[in-house]
């Protein structure tokens, strides 16, 4: 009879967790039979990041320091498997950890809204849609914000009403504004765990048009018309 | 043999959303990672984003945050992408792809389907 | 994000000839955990998929003519077809498969001179 090595139930381990997993928490497992029925003895081999400790007996991995995504997900080790006694002799096998994110990245605006305007005097109430984002990873559904004014104050002028997860419309109440710039503060809660809010400006101008752009002095770029 | 078979082309006004299927056989459904690569005319390769049919876990490529949403059914081995609020820039060809034995590599590929966005 | 960059955008090259297509990363590509390239060459011709040729910066995939070759470690990479076919013609993408996000080169043209 030849002695053969163990031999791993897998070619890859998986496991995800999030990133913000305490010290010590089990973040998945590895298991191996030997053909012979000798007892196997578990170890990892290039943990370079050193995140992570198996018991020797069970293959059971745990974290041993704190994770982080922005160092590279996923993150592979080896796992090699040795009979305990006999010829000593040893497989290898790979665990991959995903790093799954955490919610730690308030919403904010998906792109620069600088040179937002009205013609003044406006005709009739005017919108604009805006859309917002974060850096989070949403695991099991995309981003679904929920939108408000950032101030009491401007309920009076300005209303802001969600038109799906992302994207929201910005309207004016009335017609009645001056010729200058307003910045109209917007709240953005990402309903997440524990939820994350950000507020936003959005500056809006008012200003006279010439054929459907903001008239500025020579040497001002013209901004783009929203209604 | 593996197979990934894909939805029929789609024309879609802009605003609107667009829910691709891709019907996987020839393999254990929950062993492999889907991925959603798209192509626009005469460009290069974009890949938008992964699920793991096994636990739903998706993982999104930063641009399509918020637009995108993949989903899989088990019962019938199938994964979808749906992509929202479509612009023109979205009209591509989308490609599902399984990753490959033990990694992430894309070993296996749909026939594509092509989505264009015009008013 | 990991950028990956191909060069030539494109190249003609004579039946029989080598054909020599690189690519470099923003990032090392080579796991220290498991000392592996996590690199991959895809192959596509006008109105098909991508076909995968190579992974792990050198491993071919079954059924890949072995005038495919992959080379290169950590950041620079190379994709050789060794003698040139008609049938060679078509646009090459590298793509890492190291870290999410994955990513993609802008892709090389291959023609015959």
């Known amino acids: 009879d030849v002695n053969e090595a163990p031999q791993f139930s897998q070619h890859v381990f998986q496991a995800k967790v999030s990133e913000d997993v305490a010290i010590g928490t089990k973040v998945g497992n590895v298991t191996a039979k030997d053909p012979e029925g000798l007892d196997i003895s578990y170890s990892l081999r290039g943990d370079t990041r050193g995140w992570l400790k198996i018991d020797h007996v069970t293959g059971e991995i745990f974290s041993v320091a704190p994770l982080d995504r922005e160092a590279g997900s996923p993150y592979r080790v080896q796992v090699v498997a040795t009979e305990v006694g006999g010829s000593s002799l040893s497989s290898v096998s790979e665990f991959h950890l995903i790093l799954m994110d955490v919610n730690d990245n308030p919403p904010r605006l998906a792109k620069d809204y600088t040179g937002l305007f009205f013609c003044h005097p406006l005709s009739a109430p005017g919108s604009l849609i805006f859309e917002a984002t974060d850096d989070d990873q949403h695991l099991f559904r995309g981003p679904h914000f929920t939108f408000s004014l950032g101030s009491g104050s401007l309920q009076n002028d300005w209303e802001v009403s969600k038109i799906n997860g992302t994207h929201a419309r910005l309207s004016t109440r009335h017609t009645e504004f001056e010729e200058r710039e307003y910045v109209v503060l917007i709240r953005i809660n990402d309903g997440g765990r524990p939820p994350l809010e950000g507020i936003v400006s959005l500056p809006v101008t008012f200003c006279s048009c010439v054929e459907g752009s903001c008239f500025r002095p020579a040497g001002h770029k013209h901004h783009h018309h929203h209604h | 043999q593996v197979q990934l078979v894909q939805s029929g082309a789609e024309v879609k006004k802009p605003g609107a959303s667009v829910k691709v299927s891709c019907k996987a056989s020839?393999?254990?459904?929950?062993?492999?990672?889907m991925n959603w690569v798209r192509q626009a005319p005469g460009q290069g390769l974009e890949w938008m984003g992964a699920?793991?049919?096994?636990?739903?876990?998706?993982n999104y490529a930063q641009k399509f945050q918020g637009r995108v949403t993949m989903t899989r059914d088990t019962s019938t081995s199938t994964v979808y992408m749906e992509l929202s609020s479509l612009r023109s820039e979205d009209t591509a060809v989308y490609y599902c792809?399984?990753?490959?034995?033990?990694?992430?590599?894309?070993?296996?590929w749909g026939q594509g389907t092509l989505v264009t966005v015009s008013s | 994000d990991i950028v990956m960059t191909q060069s030539p955008d494109s190249l003609a090259v004579s039946l029989g000839e080598r054909a020599t297509i690189n690519c470099k990363s923003s990032?090392?590509?080579?796991?220290?955990?498991?000392?592996?390239?996590?690199l991959a060459w895809y192959q596509q011709k006008p109105g098909q998929p991508p076909k995968p040729l190579i992974y792990?910066?050198?491993t071919r995939e079954s059924g890949v003519p072995d005038r495919f070759s992959g080379s290169g470690s950590g950041t620079d990479f190379t994709l050789t077809i060794s003698s040139l076919q008609a049938e060679d013609v078509a646009v090459y993408y590298c793509?890492?498969?190291?870290?999410?996000?994955?990513?993609f080169g802008g892709g090389t043209k291959v023609e015959i001179k």
């Open positions: 792809a399984r990753g490959g034995y033990g990694d992430y590599w894309f070993a296996n």
């Open positions: 020839g393999y254990t459904f929950t062993d492999y990672w």
């Open positions: 699920i793991d049919p096994s636990d739903r876990y998706t």
């Open positions: 990032q090392n590509l080579l796991s220290s955990g498991t000392q592996k390239n996590y």
């Open positions: 792990f910066a050198s």
């Open positions: 793509q890492q498969h190291h870290y999410f996000p994955w990513t």
